[in-house]
Amino acid sequence: MAVTACQGLGFVVSLIGIAGIIAATCMDQWSTQDLYNNPVTAVFNYQGLWRSCVRESSGFTECRGYFTLLGLPAMLQAVRALMIVGIVLGAIGLLVSIFALKCIRIGSMEDSAKANMTLTSGIMFIVSGLCAIAGVSVFANMLVTNFWMSTANMYTGMGGMVQTVQTRYTFGAALFVGWVAGGLTLIGGVMMCIACRGLAPEETNYKAVSYHASGHSVAYKPGGFKASTGFGSNTKNKKIYDGGARTEDEVQSYPSKHDYV
């Protein structure tokens, strides 16, 4: 029950996070005109990853797309790439996790397969969240650098007579949306990975089987790939997951990939 709840909650948190990453990527307010300590202008500038906008106090807003690709700063291109990778990974992760949900039955899908899918989606969510956080952080760093550069020469005088006010930009709403969304996706991914640990079957679905060979009596003992002797094929036996709690005599058992989250 706790596993289902953890998995479900992880899915929901990741879903919200990815929706937030998409929203942040599409938002125009990645950087907004700094109004502090500036002359009060009747024009407000703000910029996104895809276009820049100007809102006049008249209420008229005009947005212009960045129609050039080569003319854009490399950092902006990098941020775009990180956000898109984050969205793509997150979307695939969501798709995978839907089929991995314990509460959804698809054919005769085994719990081990669901565990695999849960882990896969969890890792995808973690990477997606990290991509978003990285993208937003790179953009924020770019803003901070530009802010202090423009503050250093905020007023560029022409013979001391005419002044040009340099527009400074500060953090826009999209950055905070991106950070929070990336964090949620990351948390959701971790929850999916945790849920994966408890997803595989805890007991075998078969009875103990006796094998008879000449001169040897081999009994298969349930408990995780262990036979009383060192030979014999285990291809007929299902792998079982023992949740990582091993006794001293179980040190020879093969580690499942789910043991390492």
């Epitope: 005109q33 002359p39 009060v40 202008t41 009747a42 024009v43 500038n45 910029q47 820049s52 906008c53 100007v54 006049e56 106090s57 008249s58 209420g59 008229f60 005009e62 212009r64 005419v162 002044q163 040009t164 006010v165 340099q166 527009t167």
Partner: antibody
Framework: EVQLVESGGGLVKPGGSLRLSCAAS????????VSWVRQAPGKRLEWVAT????????YYLDSVRGRFTISRDNAKNSLYLQMNSLRAEDTAVYYC???????????WGQGTSVTVSS | DIVMTQSPSSLSVSPGERVTMSCKSS????????????LTWYQQKPGQPPKLLIY???TRESGVPDRFSGSGSGTDFTLTINSFQAEDVAVYYC?????????FGAGTKLELK
């Protein structure tokens, strides 16, 4: 047809109060920023105050800040200018205007005259 | 506050003549965000409210005759009347629409010669 009609002007003593009104029609008032501009006899135009649409941010000329209050009633398509502590230098024709692209004032009322004199 | 300086203060013009008047601002009215200059030109005839002619320094308001044109960028702006007509007798004001307070120039008075 866009129309802006001012009212409420008149003669008032220094230190007195007056409330100017502007009835707007022919456009979506609630979506427009509107301003008051005044012109003293034989003088240049002087912007007084602006109130934006939506959040209704207000901006004032330094010499009237604290004495004048611009407000709007979108339900009534009306703009107001409450003028307190009036001075002789506030004597002017007060125009109600609509802000347009480029923050330009594209429509003007005929104006209402305010005289501050003892 | 932004100071708007207009010149000349008055001008006597004959019909058909080309008229140019200047407006200078104490700070640049160019917005880096959209590369537009927030300067507006108005025409005021005696006993009437002002009429919008040009906004964004060079965009003509609809209904304004094409003999009126605006140019300039940053701090220096010009209003040109290509072929002056008798009905163009008025005072022409430029206005800073970028910084609050929105300030007007003292005006250029055009008279018929």
């Amino acid at each position: 047809e866009v129309q802006l009609v001012e009212s409420g002007g008149g003669l008032v003593k220094p230190g007195g109060s007056l409330r100017l009104s502007c009835a707007a029609s022919g456009f979506t008032f609630s979506n427009s920023a509107v301003s008051w501009v005044r012109q003293a006899p034989g003088k240049r135009l002087e912007w007084v105050a602006t109130i934006t649409s939506g959040v209704s941010y207000t901006y004032y000329l330094d010499s009237v800040r604290g004495r004048f209050t611009i407000s709007r009633d979108n339900a009534k398509n009306s703009l107001y200018l409450q003028m307190n502590s009036l001075r002789a230098e506030d004597t002017a024709v007060y125009y109600c205007t609509r802000q347009f692209k480029g923050n330009a004032l594209d429509y003007w009322g005929q104006g209402t005259s305010v005289t501050v004199s003892s | 506050d932004i100071v708007m300086t207009q010149s000349p203060s008055s001008l006597s013009v004959s019909p058909g003549e080309r008229v140019t008047m200047s407006c200078k601002s104490s700070q640049s009215l160019l917005n880096s965000g959209n590369q537009k200059n927030y300067l507006t030109w108005y025409q005021q005839k005696p006993g009437q409210p002002p009429k919008l002619l040009i906004y964004w320094a060079s965009t003509r308001e609809s209904g304004v005759p094409d003999r009126f044109s605006g140019s300039g960028s940053g701090t220096d702006f010009t209003l040109t009347i290509n072929s002056f007509q008798a009905e163009d007798v008025a005072v022409y004001y430029c206005q800073n629409d970028y910084f609050y307070p929105l300030t007007f120039g003292a005006g250029t008075k055009l008279e018929l010669k």
